[in-house]
Each structure stands twice: as C-alpha cells, then as structure tokens.
Amino acid sequence: APVPPGEDSKDVAAPHRQPLTSSERIDKQIRYILDGISALRKETCNKSNMCESSKEALAENNLNLPKMAEKDGCFQSGFNEETCLVKIITGLLEFEVYLEYLQNRFESSEEQARAVQMSTKVLIQFLQKKAKNLDAITTPDPTTNASLLTKLQAQNQWLQDMTTHLILRSFKEFLQSSLRALRQM
C-alpha cells in the first residue's frame, strides 16, 4: 500500500517546508484515496469483465450509493459551500459501510483496500473540523448498515463482483466531485 499523505520520503527530506494548510491536506488526502481506488479498480477489472459489461448486464441497481445532485450545492451552478460540505461529509459517512464490504474482496490488494478505508475515516475527520454546521450531518444508522452489509455479503459471487465494481466506480465519482467542489471553497 502507498505511504499515507505526509509520510513520504520527500516530507522527511524537506523539514523546512511550510506545513500544509487544512485545504491542502484535504486535497492531498482525497488524491491519495483516489490513487488507492485506481489500484483496486485495476484488480477488479483484470479479474473479470465487469468494468466493460456492467451497463448491459444490469437492469436495476438498488445499492443507493451516495451521489452528487444539483441540490447538494457542489456543482459550479448553484454552488453553496455549507450545503456542499454537509453533503460531502454525509456521503462519505454513507460510503463507510460499502468500504467495510470491500474488505476481504481483494486478493493482491488487501492492504490497499484497508488503506482506502482508513484514509477515508481520516478525511471525514479533516472535513468535520472544516464544517461549521455539524448538526446538519446525519450519521447512518448502525443497525441499517449491519443489515445492508449482511445483504451485500449474501449475494452470489457474480453479484458481489458487480457490487465491488459499482462501489469503486461510484466512490471515485463522488470523490472527484468533492475534490472539484472543495477547491472552490
């Protein structure tokens, strides 16, 4: 697994460099997670043809993966910093159960899956410090999450491979949208 942000050799070799600002740290954290997702997607796509055939193979997707919408205020038109930040944090909290599901779904990238999960937890903490309106952030219900996890794991092998692909694709899209929005803040 890659070294987490702030622990690479360049940081060690340059002790006099200015410390990262909060925004820079968040930006770097998201890019680090995106790198991890790319590695996981590579394994998933190499293992099966899910990545090419997912559109034709599915008629309905009831996974309810978090997705950015116009009303969330994260897009350039109708941008709203506070609404958007709440959406990003809420979305990441909702993704956590899916990231938990991804653990044990990878053979050669097991550490990478764990790194993505742990780095997302850190990212949530960074963002919570930045948010003024923490009351607006709804935390997913643990009982509902446990039930969802059981259902995800009860699927057959093919559906689990498809689920893995869909989670990684959605998480990547969500983080990319978040990154663009956070750079406007």
């Epitope: 193979a57 599915l58 008629a59 009831n62 259902k151 057959n156 093919w158 689920t163």
Partner: nanobody
Amino acid sequence: QVQLVESGGGLVQAGGSLRLSCAASGRTFSNGPMAWFRQAPGKEREFVSAISWRTGTTYYADSVKGRFTISRDNAKNTVYLQMNSLKPEDTAVYYCAAERVGLLLAVVAEGYDYWGQGTQVTVSS
C-alpha cells in the same frame, strides 16, 4: 431450500399464445428479482424478462418487447410469463430463475441463484 417449478409450455402455432407459470416454494417473495431465460438448441441461454419483487418494475429483452408480459402473484408465490404473437424463433426451453437479495437486478444468468428445470415451448410455422 428454494425450489422453482415451471409449467405451461407446449406446442403452439405461430401467432398463438401461451402462459408460463413459475411456482416457488421455500421462499418469501420480499427481496430478490425473478426472471425468465430461454435456451434454443445449440444456443446460449438468453434473458427474456424479469420482475423486481421490490419495486414491481418489469424488464424485457428487445426481441420479446410488446409481445410478452411478466407478472407476479405474491399470495401464490408465482411468476407468470404471458406470451402472445409467438414466432418460430421463440422455440426454446424456458427457465425460471430467482435471486435471493435484490440489491441488483441482472439480465444475465450469472446474476441468479436458483433455477427451475425448464419447460419446452415449441412454435410451429
């Protein structure tokens, strides 16, 4: 254990109709989708139609759209396939399939856990 039993197949003339039934036992129909697939001699098993038990939404292969109708009867734990305007190319063994969870609805055979033994449909010209 889930058991799926199809019935209603037979020999019919082109332009005729048939109604297939798929009765499920050992299953509560609250989650996963049910589907019909077919396999003609020397060909791969192909998707025909599916119904989401959760939403009631129906899906059809382009080749049967407008001619076939899938429906369900929750009380009887049964799924039906009404086939109208049958063509010789509809000749195949028709299989009923079920999936137990229902988070995803697939239109490929790999997305289903349980299968019936099949019922033969022959359409003569």
